[in-house]
Amino acid sequence: QGGAAEGVQIQIIYFNLETVQVTWNASKYSRTNLTFHYRFNGDEAYDQCTNYLLQEGHTSGCLLDAEQRDDILYFSIRNGTHPVFTASRWMVYYLKPSSPKHVRFSWHQDAVTVTCSDLSYGDLLYEVQYRSPFDTEWQSKQENTCNVTIEGLDAEKCYSFWVRVKAMEDVYGPDTYPSDWSEVTCWQRGEIRDACAETPTPPKPKLSK
């Protein structure tokens, strides 16, 4: 998302359709307090940022309340009165949904249903990843709502789970960000565990009849 204008690189993240974070990296102005000016309507005057992000004592970004705002952010990064980067962007291209909340697990024999609170907007995918110490990679399953059933689990194994939310590419484009992962939770025989042993425990011998 960065720009070539005067060597200024920018990054935009639209957190959960609520807050926009614009950060910049401008080597030419590394010891300068650049200012950030913005508007959500092309007809309005620019406002200056009131919530700057600082890096090594100098401005490096701005956090904006953008809840229920129009789709377009018009902004200008300036050195004094001189604009060093000016752009207008559809904010939703840079959507990052919030991390899943109220994650719950419901076990029934060799299957688990993972649920969480659906976000208030649509066109999202809720992804559950899981693995046991026997697995070399995470397995994944995703659904359009936060109600994901995973079948074919081994009740004797310990499984680690975590959940995240992704914006559908067909709707929001390919340059969005997935949410942060929920905390990892570990389960074995339908009960929560502190952790799954890194070394897989050998299977119990079958008792001869």
Epitope: Q1, G2, A87, S88, W90, V92, Y93, D170, G173
Partner: antibody, heavy 122, light 107 residues
């Protein structure tokens, strides 16, 4: 199969208004998630996006035209309309209507009309 | 506005060849860059969306690549119907903008 067809006068006098209609068949313009747009191509082949109207009636206009442009729709006829005021010879172009890809974010244009040439001349 | 610069302005080739053309954006636009083909007296046609994603019904000899500011459209095994003007278009910047076009002509 969606089809778009532009219609309107081929000749407009300077300072007058230009009005064009895009008739859509095979697809409803109120289908959620789709935006409907006007794009023009100048005689030198340069393309310019003019504006959108959404499934929800929301409009967006090119800032370079904002004071002169209006896009409306007539859902009963499944049409959307372009109005451009105070035209000059610089507005001579082929005008296309188009549909944007599904998705809020107006992305690319996957269905276009054949285009209609509008000449501004006295 | 995001300015898109297409090169070359004109490209001469013969059927059966492979050609590439480029589109350079004045600001980084991720992968939200789309390609169109416009043949004379026809309606423009979307070829590639989001830099490299294929479109249903478009022959597989058309391919796209790139991200950030530099993008490429490639056409393998040129056919007579491919001689046309090709435009790139960006969508994250407002307003959406098009490149000035590359005219692919028969040598």
């Amino acid at each position: 199969q969606i089809q778009l067809q532009e219609s309107g006068p081929g000749l407009v006098k300077p300072s007058q208004s230009l009005s064009l209609t895009c008739s859509v068949t095979g697809f409803s313009i109120t289908t959620s998630g789709y935006y409907w747009t006007w794009i023009r191509q100048f005689p030198g082949k340069k393309l310019e996006w003019m504006g959108y109207i959404g499934y929800n009636s929301k409009t967006y206009y090119n800032p370079s035209l904002k004071s002169r442009i209006s896009i409306t729709r007539d859902t009963s006829k499944n049409q959307f309309l372009l109005h451009l005021n105070s035209v000059t010879t610089e507005d001579t172009a082929t005008y296309y209507c188009a549909r944007s890809l599904y998705g809020g974010y107006k992305d690319a244009f996957d269905s276009w009309g054949q285009g209609t040439l509008v000449t501004v001349s006295s | 506005d995001v300015v898109l610069t297409q090169t070359p302005a004109t490209l001469s080739a013969i059927p059966g060849e492979r050609v590439t053309m480029t589109c350079k954006a004045s600001q980084s636009i991720g992968t939200s860059l789309h390609w169109y083909q416009h043949r004379p007296n026809e309606t423009p046609r979307l070829l590639i969306k989001f830099a490299s994603r294929s479109i249903t019904g478009i022959p597989s000899r058309f391919s796209g690549s790139g991200s950030g500011t530099d993008f490429t459209l490639g056409i393998n095994n040129l056919e007579a119907e491919d001689f046309a003007i090709y435009y790139c278009q960006q969508s994250p910047g407002f307003p959406p903008t098009f490149g000035s076009g590359t005219k692919l002509e028969i040598n």
